[in-house]
């Protein structure tokens, strides 16, 4: 039960995280005009990964796409790449984790296969989250660098009379969405990896003892009860009989490891 909950929660958290990464990638507010120097501007500028926008005080908003690839800063291209890789990995991870969910039965898929899929999706979520966090952090670093560079030459005098105010940009809402979303995806991935440990068949749940009978080969399993593990394995102490029968809601099915004489 605990494994199913951990896996389900990991899936939901990752789903929210990936939705957030997609939202952040699409948002226009990666950088917004710093209003510290001009809090009463009638023209507000903000920029995203794909286009830059201007909102006038009337409400009129005009956005222009970056219709060039070669002319864009390498850092921006890198951020785009990181975010896209994060989305792609996250999407694949979601697809894999759907089939890995304990509550979903697909044919006679073994728990070991589900465990492997859970681990795979967990790793994908972790990498996806790291990509998003890295992308957002690279962009934020770029903003900080440009901010202080533009502060250094904030005003360029023209004949001592005219001032040209340089537009400075600060962190936009998309950065915070990206950081939170990346964090959630990362947490979801970790949860999936933890759930995988509970799903995986354990090597030695019990010791099989072999008895050498004179006439027939008989294997006897002492105890009759499966040992309880820390990851939700048979907490109800259901009796496991020699015939190999398993109750349907049992958490794990173990391969038989007996010495036959």
């Amino acid at each position: 039960m605990a494994v199913t909950a951990c896996q389900g929660l990991g899936f939901v958290v990752s789903l929210i995280g990936i939705a957030g990464i997609i939202a952040a990638t699409c948002m226009d507010q990666w950088s917004t005009q710093d209003l510290y120097n001009n809090p009463v501007t009638a023209v507000f500028n903000y920029q995203g990964l794909w286009r830059s926008c201007v909102r006038e005080s009337s409400g009129f908003t005009e956005c222009r796409g970056y219709f060039t690839l070669l002319g864009l800063p390498a850092m921006l291209q890198a951020v785009r790449a990181l975010m896209i890789v994060g989305i792609v990995l996250g999407a694949i991870g979601l697809l894999v984790s759907i089939f890995a969910l304990k509550c979903i039965r697909i044919g006679s898929m073994e728990d070991s296969a589900k465990a492997n899929m859970t681990l795979t999706s967990g790793i994908m979520f972790i990498v996806s989250g790291l990509c998003a966090i890295a992308g957002v952090s690279v962009f934020a670093n770029m903003l900080v660098t440009n901010f202080w560079m533009s502060t250094a030459n904030m005003y360029t005098g023209m004949g001592g009379m005219v001032q040209t105010v340089q537009t400075r940009y600060t962190f936009g809402a998309a950065l915070f969405v990206g950081w939170v979303a990346g964090g959630l995806t990362l947490i979801g991935g970790v949860m999936m990896c933890i759930a995988c440990r509970g799903l995986a068949p354990e090597e030695t749940n019990y010791k099989a003892v072999s008895y050498h009978a004179s006439g027939h080969s008989v294997a006897y399993k002492p105890g009759g009860f499966k040992a309880s593990t820390g990851f939700g394995s048979n907490t109800k102490n259901k009796k496991i009989y020699d015939g190999g029968a398993r109750t349907e809601d049992e958490v794990q099915s173990y391969p038989s490891k007996h010495d036959y004489v």
């Epitope: 005009q33 009463v40 023209v43 830059s52 201007v54 006038e56 005080s57 009337s58 005219v162 040209t164």
Partner: antibody, heavy 119, light 113 residues
Framework: EVQLVESGGGLVQPGGSLRLSCAAS????????MHWVRQAPGKGLEWVSY????????YFTDTVKGRFTISRDNAKNSLYLQMNSLRAEDTAVYYC????????????WGQGTLVTVSS | DIVMTQSPDSLAVSLGERATINCRSS????????????LTWYQQKPGQPPKLLIY???TRESGVPDRFSGSGSGTDFTLTISSLQAEDVAVYYC?????????FGGGTKLEIK
């Protein structure tokens, strides 16, 4: 046809108060920002205040800050300018103007209402 | 606040001739985000409210005759009337539309010579 009609002007003593109104028609009032601009007799134009379509934020010229308040009632298609602590230099024709959708400009103006501050 | 300075204060031009009015701002009105200049031109005829002529420094308002044109960028702007008509006699104002408080130039009175 877009129409803006100002009212509420008149003679007032220094330190007194006055409330100007601007009745709008011919357009969807609630979707446009609105300005107040004044013109002293024989002088140039002076922008006074602006209120966005959503009633916030609002802006004022430095000379009227703390004395004038701008408000609007979208249900009544009306714009208001509450003027307190009036001074002689506030004497002017007050125009209400609609903010154009483009360029932060003012595309339609009322005929104006005269405010005279004198003892 | 951005200070708007218009020149000349008054201008007399013959009918059919070109009239040029200048406007200078104390700060650049060019917005880097969209490369637009936030300068507006208005015309005010005697006894009437102002009328919008040009916004974004060079975009004519609908209904404004094409003899009116605006140019310039950054801090220096020009309103040109290519062929003066009798009905163009008015006072012309430039306005900063870039940051609050919006400020107007002192106005240029255009007359017929």
């Amino acid at each position: 046809e877009v129409q803006l009609v100002e009212s509420g002007g008149g003679l007032v003593q220094p330190g007194g108060s006055l409330r100007l109104s601007c009745a709008a028609s011919g357009f969807t009032f609630s979707t446009f920002g609105m300005h107040w601009v004044r013109q002293a007799p024989g002088k140039g134009l002076e922008w006074v205040s602006y209120i966005t379509s959503g009633e916030s934020p609002i802006y004022f010229t430095d000379t009227v800050k703390g004395r004038f308040t701008i408000s609007r009632d979208n249900a009544k298609n009306s714009l208001y300018l509450q003027m307190n602590s009036l001074r002689a230099e506030d004497t002017a024709v007050y125009y209400c103007a609609r903010s154009s959708y483009y360029g932060n400009s003012m595309d339609y103006w009322g005929q104006g209402t005269l405010v005279t501050v004198s003892s | 606040d951005i200070v708007m300075t218009q020149s000349p204060d008054s201008l007399a031009v013959s009918l059919g001739e070109r009239a040029t009015i200048n406007c200078r701002s104390s700060q650049s009105l060019l917005n880097a985000g969209n490369r637009k200049n936030y300068l507006t031109w208005y015309q005010q005829k005697p006894g009437q409210p102002p009328k919008l002529l040009i916004y974004w420094a060079s975009t004519r308002e609908s209904g404004v005759p094409d003899r009116f044109s605006g140019s310039g960028s950054g801090t220096d702007f020009t309103l040109t009337i290519s062929s003066l008509q009798a009905e163009d006699v008015a006072v012309y104002y430039c306005q900063n539309a870039y940051s609050y408080p919006f400020t107007f130039g002192g106005g240029t009175k255009l007359e017929i010579k």
